[in-house]
């Protein structure tokens, strides 16, 4: 039950996170005009990854796309790439995790396969979240650098009577959306990985004896000290020795050639 809850919650958190990453990537407010020196501007500038916009006091907003690839800063291209990779990985992760959900039955899918898929999607969510956080952080660092550079330019070469105030940009709403969304995707991914451990078939370290009413031979099974990776060959998720207890996932298994030594 706890495993299902952890997996379900991880999926929901990741879903919200990826939706946030997509929203942040599409948003125009990655950087907004710094109004510290000019709080009453009649022209407000803001920029996104794909276009820059100007909102005038009249209520008119004009946006212009960046119609060049080669003319854009390498850092901006890198941020775009990171965000897109994050979205693609997150989307694939979501797709994989839907089939991995314990509460969803798809044919006769084994629990080990579900565990596998849960881990895969978890890793994808973690990488997706890291991509988003990295992208947003790179952009934020670029803004901070440019902010201080333009501040330095503002106060130099002002010997004349005419002031040319350079537009400075500060953090826009998209950065905060991106950070939060990336964090949520990361947390969701971690939860999926934790859920994967609970889904994986357990193999105990002690020896067990299996009795079969149908046969006259007694099978002696050494439990051994098998490394428990979570992806063993025991596809039925059935403990070798169950001590009389059965889980709802366990179905009656019939002897096969592998049951006998």
């Amino acid at each position: 039950m706890a495993v299902t809850a952890c997996q379900g919650l991880g999926f929901v958190v990741s879903l919200i996170g990826i939706a946030g990453i997509i929203a942040a990537t599409c948003m125009d407010q990655w950087s907004t005009q710094d109004l510290y020196n000019n709080p009453v501007t009649a022209v407000f500038n803001y920029q996104g990854l794909w276009r820059s916009c100007v909102r005038e006091s009249s209520g008119f907003t004009e946006c212009r796309g960046y119609f060049t690839l080669l003319g854009l800063p390498a850092m901006l291209q890198a941020v775009r790439a990171l965000m897109i990779v994050g979205i693609v990985l997150g989307a694939i992760g979501l797709l994989v995790s839907i089939f991995a959900l314990k509460c969803i039955r798809i044919g006769s899918m084994e629990d080990s396969a579900k565990a596998n898929m849960t881990l895969t999607s978890g890793i994808m969510f973690i990488v997706s979240g890291l991509c988003a956080i990295a992208g947003v952080s790179v952009f934020a660092n670029m803004l901070v650098t440019n902010f201080w550079m333009s501040t330095a330019n503002m106060y130099t070469g002002m010997g004349g009577m005419v002031q040319t105030v350079q537009t400075r940009y500060t953090f826009g709403a998209a950065l905060f959306v991106g950070w939060v969304a990336g964090g949520l995707t990361l947390i969701g991914g971690v939860m999926m990985c934790i859920a994967c451990r609970g889904l994986a078939p357990e193999e105990t370290n002690y020896k067990a004896v299996s009795y079969h009413a149908s046969g006259h031979s007694v099978a002696y099974k050494p439990g051994g000290f098998k490394a428990s990776t979570g992806f063993g060959s025991n596809t039925k998720n059935k403990k070798i020795y169950d001590g009389g207890a059965r889980t709802e996932d366990e179905v009656q298994s019939y002897p096969s050639k592998h049951d006998y030594v």
Partner: antibody
Framework: EVMLVESGGGVVQPGGSLRLSCAAS????????MSWVRQTPEKRLEWVAT????????YYLDSVKGRFTISRDNAKNTLYLQMNSLRTEDTALYYC?????????????WGQGTLITVSS | DIVMTQSPDSLAVSLGERATINCKSS????????????LAWYQQKPGQPPKLLIY???TRESGVPDRFSGSGFGTDFTLTISSLQAEDVAVYYC?????????FGAGTKLEIK
């Protein structure tokens, strides 16, 4: 046809109050940012206040801040300027003007103006 | 506040001649975000309210004759009337549309010589 008609002007003593109105017609009033501009007896134009379409943002000339209040009633298509603590230097012809949507914040339509004289 | 300085204060030009009015702002009216200059020119005839002629430093308002043209960038702007007509006798004002307060120039009185 766009029409802006100001009213409410008159003679008032220093420290007195007046409320100017501007009735707008011929356009979707709620969409447009509106302004009050005054013209002094020396014929100088002086922007007084601006209110955006939804009424959420207002801007004032420093010398009138705290004394004048710009407001609008989009249902009545009317712009207002409440003027308190009037001074002699507030004597002017007050114009109501519309800020054009695509005119880079320029005032594309003006009313005929209403005269305010602050005198003791 | 942005100070708008117009020159000359008054100007007398012969009919059919070119009239040039200058306007200088104390701060740049250029917006890097959309590469536009936020300056407007108005014409005011006696007993009438001001009329918008030019916005964005160089764009003519609809209905304005093409003899009126605006130019300039940043802090220095010019209004040019290529061939003066009798009906152009008026006071011309430039205005900062970039930053509040939206300041006006003192005006230039244009007369016929």
């Amino acid at each position: 046809e766009v029409m802006l008609v100001e009213s409410g002007g008159g003679v008032v003593q220093p420290g007195g109050s007046l409320r100017l109105s501007c009735a707008a017609s011929g356009f979707t009033f709620s969409t447009y940012t509106m302004s009050w501009v005054r013209q002094t007896p020396e014929k100088r134009l002086e922007w007084v206040a601006t209110i955006v379409g939804g009424g959420g943002y207002t801007y004032y000339l420093d010398s009138v801040k705290g004394r004048f209040t710009i407001s609008r009633d989009n249902a009545k298509n009317t712009l207002y300027l409440q003027m308190n603590s009037l001074r002699t230097e507030d004597t002017a012809l007050y114009y109501c003007a519309r800020m054009g949507l695509t005119q880079r914040n320029a005032l594309d339509y003006w009313g005929q103006g209403t005269l305010i004289t602050v005198s003791s | 506040d942005i100070v708008m300085t117009q020159s000359p204060d008054s100007l007398a030009v012969s009919l059919g001649e070119r009239a040039t009015i200058n306007c200088k702002s104390s701060q740049s009216l250029f917006n890097s975000g959309n590469q536009k200059n936020y300056l407007a020119w108005y014409q005011q005839k006696p007993g009438q309210p001001p009329k918008l002629l030019i916005y964005g430093a160089s764009t003519r308002e609809s209905g304005v004759p093409d003899r009126f043209s605006g130019s300039g960038f940043g802090t220095d702007f010019t209004l040019t009337i290529s061939s003066l007509q009798a009906e152009d006798v008026a006071v011309y004002y430039c205005q900062n549309d970039h930053t509040y307060p939206l300041t006006f120039g003192a005006g230039t009185k244009l007369e016929i010589k």
